[in-house]
């Protein structure tokens, strides 16, 4: 699994509904593949992590300025919705085809 | 200025052109406030961070499996362009009035 | 030396089209970002748009006044910038300048006239 | 009315100094990308300077500050050449272009 050392990427998350108390309104599924994105934004930044401009200038000043600036961040750049059948509020199951936000499509550094 | 403990919030970030070596085509300014994104995304994730969905579910996993998943990340969610002056090949100064993506506008949890 | 010389100004009607042209030489033309800029009859300077490099995307933007009837092209072969113009009005009577931000052309006058 | 105001005339004798304000009304507007163009009578256009750079053959008579939402165009040892027209511009980050303001006309006097 990709860890700090590696370089940004999209690493598998299972996400289990009853852990994060959600299993109270969402019926189905159980759990879902929600992934994570893992890994530091190193310079030189590579075309694949589709950095911003201004990714590629906190990178450089990082390398100048270690202590003082951050690296970028590897964080979803594009997600992807799911679907979920889940309780109304009068407790009723109703599907939601296209629950956005919920999974990653691709990682980035920002 | 806010380190880790503090939540995530922008804070000032002025970028010298000479110190990231973009002095040899960027003619004006000579430095720049580019912003820094700093902070954590600390459970519950409040709305001035503008959580995705993707977001507010990875920081409940943290929550239960802390050493397994990551917390969000505080990155620039919007980002502004600045006006530069650069140099072009035959080395004549032209101004790009709306050079993208070049300071933040605003933080977020991702 | 740069250089940047407009043409194609003149006199049409309400509702009627012109196309003005840039000629520009004395810098990396295809590397530049070129705008059109506007100054009405005793008035002040007026943003109309801008085309980006080829590098950068080659994207336009438009002021709100002539968006939707302008448009801005170029021939990076030819060092040449156009700015096609559709639907005139006659408050688009102004002298239209091509420039770099830092250089500008002498500019051409459009009268828009019954 | 532009976001840019600046005072529609200014005026000064032969050696003098001369001010012209261009003052920020929209927050749209970034004041660290002010910059200023002359038009003297019957010409186009001419970039003064840009932050701290001035182009070769602009006279170091003309200086600019900036200072909160308020930019100034100082020019000293006034000519009867500098007369004409002066106007600031601006990146204005919604219009994804530069705005200028009014424009102020510089009268020599005597």
């Known amino acids: 699994s990709a860890g700090a050392g590696s370089h940004c990427q999209k690493t598998s998350l299972r996400v289990n509904f009853e852990d994060i108390g959600w299993d109270s309104w969402i019926i189905a599924p159980k759990e879902y593949e929600a992934y994570e994105c893992k890994g530091g934004c190193f310079f030189p930044l590579a075309d694949d992590v589709t950095p911003t401009k201004h990714a590629i200038v906190q990178t450089l000043v990082h390398l100048k300025f270690p202590t003082k600036v951050g690296k970028a961040c590897c964080v979803p750049t594009k997600l992807s919705p799911i679907s979920v059948l889940y309780k109304d509020d009068m407790g009723v199951p109703t599907l939601k085809y296209h629950y956005e936000g919920m999974s990653v499509a691709e990682c980035g550094c920002r | 200025s806010a380190g880790a403990g503090s939540h995530c919030q922008k804070t000032s970030l002025r970028v010298n052109f000479e110190d990231i070596g973009w002095d040899s085509w960027i003619i004006a300014p000579k430095e720049y406030e580019a912003y820094e994104c700093k902070g954590g995304c600390f459970f519950p994730l409040a709305d001035d961070v503008t959580p995705t969905k993707h977001a507010i579910v990875q920081t409940l996993v943290h929550l239960k499996f802390p050493t397994k998943v990551g917390k969000a990340c505080c990155v620039p969610t919007k980002l502004s362009p600045i006006s530069v002056l650069y140099k072009d090949d035959m080395g004549v100064p032209t101004l790009k009035y709306h050079y993208e993506g070049m300071s933040v506008a605003e933080c977020g949890c991702r | 030396e740069v250089q940047l010389v407009e043409s194609g100004g003149g006199l049409v009607k309400p509702g009627g089209s012109l196309r003005l042209s840039c000629a520009a030489s004395?810098?990396?033309?295809?590397?530049?970002?070129l705008s059109w800029v506007r100054q009405a009859p005793g008035k002040g300077l007026e943003w109309v748009g801008r085309?980006?490099?080829?590098?950068?995307?080659?994207?336009?933007d438009y002021a709100a006044p002539v968006k939707g009837r302008f448009t801005i092209s170029r021939d990076d072969s030819k060092n040449t910038l156009y700015l096609q113009m559709n639907s005139l009005k006659t408050e688009d009577t102004a002298v239209y300048y091509c420039?770099?931000?830092?250089?500008w052309g002498q500019g051409t006058l459009v009268t828009v006239s019954s | 009315q532009s976001v840019l105001t600046q005072p529609p005339s200014a005026s000064g004798t032969p050696g003098q100094r001369v001010t012209i304000s261009c003052s920020v009304t929209n927050s749209d507007i970034d004041i660290d990308n002010v910059h200023w163009y002359q038009q003297l009578p019957g010409m186009a256009p001419k970039l003064l300077f840009f932050h701290d750079y001035r182009p070769s053959g602009v006279s170091d008579r003309f200086s600019g500050s900036k200072s909160g939402t308020s930019a100034s165009l100082a020019i000293v040892g006034l000519q009867s050449e500098d007369e004409g027209y002066y106007y600031c511009a601006g990146l204005d980050v919604a219009m994804r272009g530069p705005v200028f303001g009014g424009g102020t006309k510089l009268t020599v006097l005597g």
């Open positions: 420039t770099t931000g830092t250089y």
């Open positions: 004395g810098f990396t033309f295809s590397n530049a970002w």
């Open positions: 085309i980006k490099s080829k590098t950068d995307g080659g994207t336009t």
